[in-house]
């Protein structure tokens, strides 16, 4: 039985050219963390962090994702092609899959705010 | 130039155990790579058996899971599989692969694989 | 365990046809598969990893495409030597799994 629970940033946003940590967590289970997959809109993966292996990251993104804080993500550089969601997806044992979503705006305007909040999706 | 070549016995009677060994040359198994042994059974389905890691963690197929140890000698640049409990079923050519995990994500080298039938 | 499948087992084409491959995964597995050549005798040979990226070495005829479920594997003008099974793997998730291998048989 799955009784974890993903907490993720939520709806963010963040200025064109700079950057935005992508962040979930996983909590209310004792199961294991075996790998985390991150994701884009359009399917492309952006990195995977294995627990054995550790980090890998995409080559489309290479140059501008970096790897955590802790089993999240930053990416830098950000375009106005960057908006849209992202998903972490945890691959737990014995749970099974779990799934956050995030959705980033990337905005034009300098006087942008990085808003980002934990919240239950 | 980075080599794996496998070693072990031919053949291998019911019930008994299989042990195996990569050796591996041209790079050290404590850098970077998983190293992993694969298995193709005739008719050539490939199977992922499982890895361990540079650092020396494992993982392994929960089809194997009761069944396979895989180990490492770091002194001797080698690797080793054993699997238990052995049926007609385990009768395939065993590969020994590293996994390339910073750019490539998948499985670059490849030793030259060694028959094993299961046979009485 | 997520299962890839590849609904020919056998292909046949001429030397200079186009010929493409399909594999579809049981689940969503993003970009995470590769493909491998095997030539008779050999052991498997890694072709396009992340599903569309060439390999160090690979010639350009060999190319890959895909996201999510289906994935395609092309050889935009076969040689001779393309004479292989080719095999699709994914690594989305543990325990990492091959398709059952397309053969290419050359007329």
């Known amino acids: 039985m799955m009784t974890g629970t993903i907490e993720t940033t939520g709806n963010i946003s963040a200025k064109k050219g700079g950057s935005v940590i992508l962040q979930c967590h996983l909590s209310s289970t004792m199961a294991q963390v075996t790998q985390v997959n991150w994701e884009q809109h359009d399917h492309s993966l952006l990195a995977i962090r294995n627990a054995e292996l550790g980090w890998h990251i995409y080559p489309a993104f290479k140059d501008r994702v970096a790897p955590g804080p802790g089993l999240g993500l930053t990416l830098q550089s950000l375009t106005m092609n960057d908006t849209g969601e992202y998903f972490c997806t945890y691959h737990t044992y014995p749970d099974g899959t779990y799934r956050g979503r995030i959705f980033l705006e990337v905005l034009e305007s300098s006087v942008a705010e990085h808003s980002a909040r934990f919240q239950i999706p | 130039d980075v080599q794996l070549q496998e070693s072990g016995p031919g053949l291998v009677k019911p019930s008994q155990s299989l042990s195996l060994t990569c050796t591996v040359t041209?790079?050290?198994?404590?850098?970077?790579?998983?190293w992993n042994w694969i298995r193709q059974f005739p008719g050539n389905k490939l199977e992922w058996m499982g890895y361990?890691?540079?650092?020396?963690?494992?993982r392994s197929n929960p089809s194997l899971k009761s069944r396979i140890s895989i180990t490492r000698d770091t002194s001797k640049n080698q690797f080793f599989l054993q699997l238990n409990s052995m049926t007609a079923e385990d009768t395939a050519t065993y590969y020994c692969?590293?996994?390339?995990?910073?750019?490539?994500?998948?499985?670059?080298?490849w030793g030259q694989g060694t028959s094993v039938t299961v046979s009485s | 365990d997520i299962v890839m499948t590849q609904s020919h087992k056998f292909m046949s084409t001429s030397v200079g046809d186009r010929v493409s491959i399909t594999c579809k995964a049981s689940?969503?597995?993003?970009?995470?598969v590769a493909w491998y050549q095997q030539k008779p005798g050999q052991s498997p040979k890694l072709l396009i990893y992340?599903?569309?990226y060439r390999y160090t070495g690979v010639p350009d005829r060999f190319t890959g495409s895909g996201s999510g479920t289906d994935f395609t594997f092309t050889i935009s003008s076969v040689q001779a030597e393309d004479l292989a099974v080719y095999y699709c793997?994914?690594?989305?998730?543990?325990?990492?799994?091959f398709g059952g291998g397309t053969k290419l048989e050359i007329k």
């Open positions: 692969g590293g996994w390339e995990v910073r750019n490539y994500y998948a499985m670059d080298y």
């Open positions: 041209g790079y050290s198994i404590t850098s970077d790579y998983a």
């Open positions: 361990i890691s540079y650092s020396g963690s494992t």
């Open positions: 689940q969503h597995v993003s970009t995470a």
């Open positions: 992340s599903a569309s």
């Open positions: 793997q994914q690594h989305y998730n543990t325990p990492w799994t």
